[in-house]
């Protein structure tokens, strides 16, 4: 996250980290005892789970082992349209007050509406520096409009923009996958933006998770 | 189809300054996402990057070149520019101009100019 | 800066042959590493991105694959056109990086 801040000690009890061995891979989000929401694009062949702790490679978090994942069938790696996977623990999570599995949308959230993104992503751009706190930025929803200004052929359909016009604050390598939080609601998984981070008036591309519910509730009830 | 034309003189003289200028066209040098390089390549040499521009103005050199180089823009005219001063004979290249998609997901060359012959001498 | 070894710096080959282009990267790049074709007196041209995806329009004889500091290139079946020369390039870290060239040609 760029330009951002710590987040409050346990704000985020859905927020997951997807490791490479110790090394952060992606951010991702608890949805179920045994499903965790990321970005098609943070696919391995297995992920190491770290869940309940705002410090990444903490040792008294939760870890499991993950080794089916199922990417959206539209995702393409080109042009990151349905940016959009599931990752099935090995072994459900224990829930706790540090462990608790976020709200799906309702509703799409309008723009204008003000979020948080959270991450343990590089904090500067383009020379790298990797917090081991969770870092938050709030953010406000922008609309399809308004950014296919900026992105014009980049913008997909089901992709949801979000920034604070004339700052920095963005997300960047490491957030991916990550939560995009509105009015308690996950609206967004971190998908892409521009490199290096931080450019004022390129927002933060996400997928508009609001568009892709149906989805998650079929894949989780198929893959029981 | 986006295209990239580089123009320019072909010979400059020792110590004086390059400029090379690429105009774009099939695509809007303002779009956010796609940014602006030049990349030269010495007589039967590898690829050397020089650095780019984006839609803001902002610009990243490569610092071995840092302090002969100033990349410009001009959005009106869809076009971006290249000075290099200070050249000796070891500026004597095929200078490219190129677009790259440069995302946090990925990042690469997607389309060139033809590249035009710069030879330093006197 | 990160450096590029590309190997080998030549190589001839008879056409349907399987030709391999390493690059080692001097550092981890995740799989921030594209591959060009250049042919003489024109530009390169994006073969590969992201190590192992295919650009838009490339024959599927050319393939990539490798992540962190190691990739490979490939052509399954060397055609008269692929007589070129492969760069690779890094494109983790700024400086962007390229490799010093494979220059194929056949036998």
């Known amino acids: 996250i760029i330009d951002g801040y710590k987040c409050k000690e346990g704000s985020h009890p859905w927020q997951v980290a997807l490791l490479k061995g110790n090394q952060l891979h992606c951010g991702g989000v608890l949805v179920d005892k045994y499903w965790v929401l990321t970005a098609a694009h943070c696919k391995m062949g297995q992920y190491q789970v770290q869940l309940g702790s705002d410090k990444i490679g903490d040792q008294s978090a939760q870890k499991i082992k993950a080794t089916k994942s199922f990417r959206h069938p539209g995702y393409s790696t080109k042009t990151h349209v349905n940016d959009i996977m599931l990752v099935r623990l090995d072994e459900p999570v224990k829930m706790s007050s540090k462990v608790e599995a976020v709200q799906l949308p309702e509703h799409c959230e309008p723009p204008g509406t003000s979020c948080t993104v959270s991450g343990w992503g590089t904090t500067t751009s383009p020379d790298v520096t990797f917090p081991s706190d969770l870092m938050c930025s709030d953010v406000k929803l922008i609309s399809s409009r308004e950014c296919k200004k900026v992105y014009k052929d980049l913008l997909g359909k089901t992709m949801l923009c979000a920034g604070i016009p004339d700052s920095k604050t963005n997300t960047c390598n490491g957030d991916s996958g990550g939560p995009l939080v509105c009015n308690d609601t996950l609206q967004g998984l971190v998908s892409w933006g521009t490199y290096p981070c931080g450019q004022p008036n390129d927002p933060g591309v996400y997928t508009q998770v609001c568009k892709y519910k149906r989805w998650v509730m079929e894949t989780m009830k198929t893959h029981r | 189809q986006v295209q990239l034309q580089e123009s320019g003189p072909g010979l400059v003289k020792p110590s004086q300054t390059l400029s090379l200028t690429c105009t774009v066209s099939?695509?809007?040098?303002?779009?956010?996402?796609?940014?602006w390089h030049w990349i030269r390549q010495h007589p039967g040499k590898g690829l050397e990057w020089i650095g780019y521009i984006y839609r803001s103005g902002y610009t990243y050199y490569n610092p071995s070149l840092k302090s002969r180089v100033t990349i410009s823009v001009d959005t009106s005219k869809n076009q971006f520019s290249l000075k290099l001063s200070s050249v000796t004979a070891a500026d004597t290249a095929v200078y490219y101009c190129a677009r790259a998609k440069q995302l946090t997901t990925h990042r690469y060359f997607d389309y060139w100019g033809q590249g035009t012959l710069v030879t330093v001498s006197s | 800066d990160i450096q590029m070894t590309q190997s080998p710096s030549s190589l001839s080959a008879s056409v349907g042959d399987r030709v391999t282009i390493t690059c080692q990267a001097s550092q981890d790049i995740a799989n921030y590493l594209n591959w060009y074709q250049q042919k003489p007196g024109k530009a390169p041209k994006l073969l590969i991105y992201?190590?192992?995806n295919l650009e838009t329009g490339v024959p599927s004889r050319f393939s990539g694959s490798g992540s962190g500091t190691d990739f490979t290139f490939t052509i399954s079946s060397l055609q008269p056109e692929d007589i070129a020369t492969y760069y690779c390039?890094?494109?983790?870290?700024?400086?962007?990086?390229f490799g010093g060239g494979t220059k194929v040609e056949i036998k």
């Open positions: 099939g695509g809007s040098i303002s779009s956010g996402g796609y940014y």
């Open positions: 992201d190590a192992s």
């Open positions: 390039q890094q494109a983790s870290d700024l400086p962007f990086t």
